[in-house]
Each structure stands twice: as structure tokens, then as C-alpha cells.
């Protein structure tokens, strides 16, 4: 999917409203300062398609966050602002539906979502210069 | 341009209600959500209740299920906030707020309806006050 034509303000609303704060809630009891962030985006665009494959694409070690309320936000803010995504997400649904697996946090998600804090961040800044 | 004019408000009993309009103009009412929103002096502006005029959702704050109810008439371009068995504590400024990609994802907008910095347009509001 080209995020290009979301809308990249409502979707930083929405995440300063509320899908930040589920994030943090996830990763309680963790020190910030525990996982460094090997992720980094370069736009806007960039940012989401980064984000949508860290929330959404199992990963060794993580199977799965979907069912995670950040993620469950996630996906309804990408199919509101994000025109013509959630048709791109239907076959994506049908196939993680068959392979859903019972949720469990694992150190290895708990890193993941701590690369998804700060391709979120960098969302948010999008004229800061590329470190 | 877009308009949205709040009417209805006025001082109350406990108990009593009041139906407040929201009457828009200026965008393709069919395809929009519109939410009411209320602020009492001092406090955030919270969410009371949202509706899709595209498939005619409903969602409520807790504090007022039950006892609001949204509607929306499309053909007029008005939605309606009828309040019984109010409280003091629903008095309030109350708004009503537009947003466009919402009112066509109407499922989707169950986490973020009642989140003010999401909306596009408002009306200027008009006073709710119940007595005790």
C-alpha cells in the first residue's frame, strides 16, 4: 500500500489522543533506555509503511501484535485516513486469522514495540533532518 | 462555507430535558460523522455522543447512556441531542463537531470518535445549565 495520500495530521491526532498511550501501557515495567532503536523512516509515508510492517508482519521471536489494542487502533486509523486501505488489508486479515496464536509478550515484542515508539516520534517530526 | 449552528439550549430542572439541533451546511452532510461534544468551566471537552449519517452508528459516552439520544435527519442536513433525565452535571457548553473520513468508517471510529483534536469543523455551542 502507498500511504502517500493519508491523511498524516488526523493520524498524528490520533495517535497523540490515543494510540500513544496504549503503546505506554505495553511497554510498563520496561526502562526506556533498554532497547535501542535500530528502526528509522524517512517520511511520512515511510514512516507508516514501517510501522505497519512492525505492528502487523509476524517476526521471529514475536509472532504476533495485531490483537494488541495499539495495533487494533492502528489499523482503524490507517483504513479511516488512508484512502483505499483497508480494501489492501482484506486477503492480509483472512490469512493472519488462520495463523492467529495466543498472545504472549515476549522480551522480542517488547523490543518491537519499542522500535514502533520511535518510528511513531519520528512521524510526528517529519521536518526534523534525518540523524 | 461550512456551517454548523447549535439551538436548544436553556436552563432546566433536574430531571427535565432539553433536545438540542445541530443544523450543518457548506459539505455532503450524508458522508460525515457528527459528534456533540460538551465542556463545563474548567474541565476538557469531552465526547457525549457521535453518529454516521452514512449508516446512521451510534456511540455514547458512558456518563450519558440511557439517557441521550443521538439522531440525524439527512434530508434537513440536522442531527439532534435529545437529553433526558438530566443532572447538574450535565451542564455544559455543548458543541457539535463534523469530521469526513469517520462518518464513511463508522466501525473504525469506535476508538477515536470522542477525541475533540480529530474534528474539522465546529459550531459555537450553546449553554446547557440544570438546576438541582
Known amino acids: 500500500y502507498d500511504f502517500t495520500n493519508c491523511d498524516f495530521e488526523k493520524i498524528k491526532a490520533a495517535y497523540l489522543s490515543t494510540i500513544s498511550k496504549d503503546l505506554i501501557t505495553y511497554m510498563s515495567g520496561t526502562k526506556s533506555t533498554e532497547f535501542n532503536n535500530t528502526v528509522s523512516c524517512s517520511n511520512r509515508p515511510h514512516c507508516l509503511t514501517e510501522i505497519q510492517s512492525l505492528t502487523f508482519n509476524p517476526t521471529a521471536g514475536c509472532a504476533s501484535l495485531a490483537k494488541e489494542m495499539f495495533a487494533m487502533k492502528t489499523k482503524a486509523a490507517l483504513a479511516i485516513w488512508c484512502p483505499g486501505y483497508s480494501e489492501t488489508q482484506i486477503n492480509a486479515t483472512q490469512a493472519m486469522k488462520k495463523r492467529r496464536k495466543r498472545k504472549v509478550t515476549t522480551n522480542k515484542c517488547l523490543e518491537q514495540v519499542s522500535q514502533l515508539q520511535g518510528l511513531w516520534r519520528r512521524f510526528n517530526r517529519p521536518l526534523l533532518k534525518q540523524q | 462555507q461550512v456551517q454548523l449552528v447549535e439551538s436548544g439550549g436553556g436552563l432546566v430542572q433536574a430531571g427535565g430535558s432539553l433536545r438540542l439541533s445541530c443544523a450543518a451546511s457548506g459539505f455532503t452532510f450524508d458522508d460525515y460523522a457528527i459528534t456533540w461534544f460538551r465542556q463545563a468551566p474548567g474541565k476538557e471537552r469531552e465526547g457525549v455522543a457521535y453518529i454516521s449519517n452514512s449508516d446512521g452508528m451510534t456511540y455514547y459516552a458512558d456518563s450519558v447512556k440511557g439517557r441521550f439520544t443521538i439522531s440525524s435527519d439527512n434530508a434537513k442536513n440536522t442531527v439532534y441531542l435529545q437529553m433526558d433525565s438530566l443532572k447538574p452535571e450535565d451542564t455544559a457548553v455543548y458543541y457539535c463537531?463534523?469530521?469526513?473520513?469517520?462518518?464513511?468508517?463508522?466501525?473504525?471510529?469506535?476508538?477515536?470518535?470522542?477525541?475533540?483534536?480529530?474534528?474539522?469543523?465546529w459550531g459555537q455551542g450553546t449553554q446547557v445549565t440544570v438546576s438541582s
Open positions: 463537531a463534523a469530521e469526513g473520513r469517520m462518518g464513511t468508517h463508522s466501525r473504525d471510529s469506535v476508538y477515536f470518535w470522542a477525541f475533540s483534536a480529530l474534528y474539522d469543523y
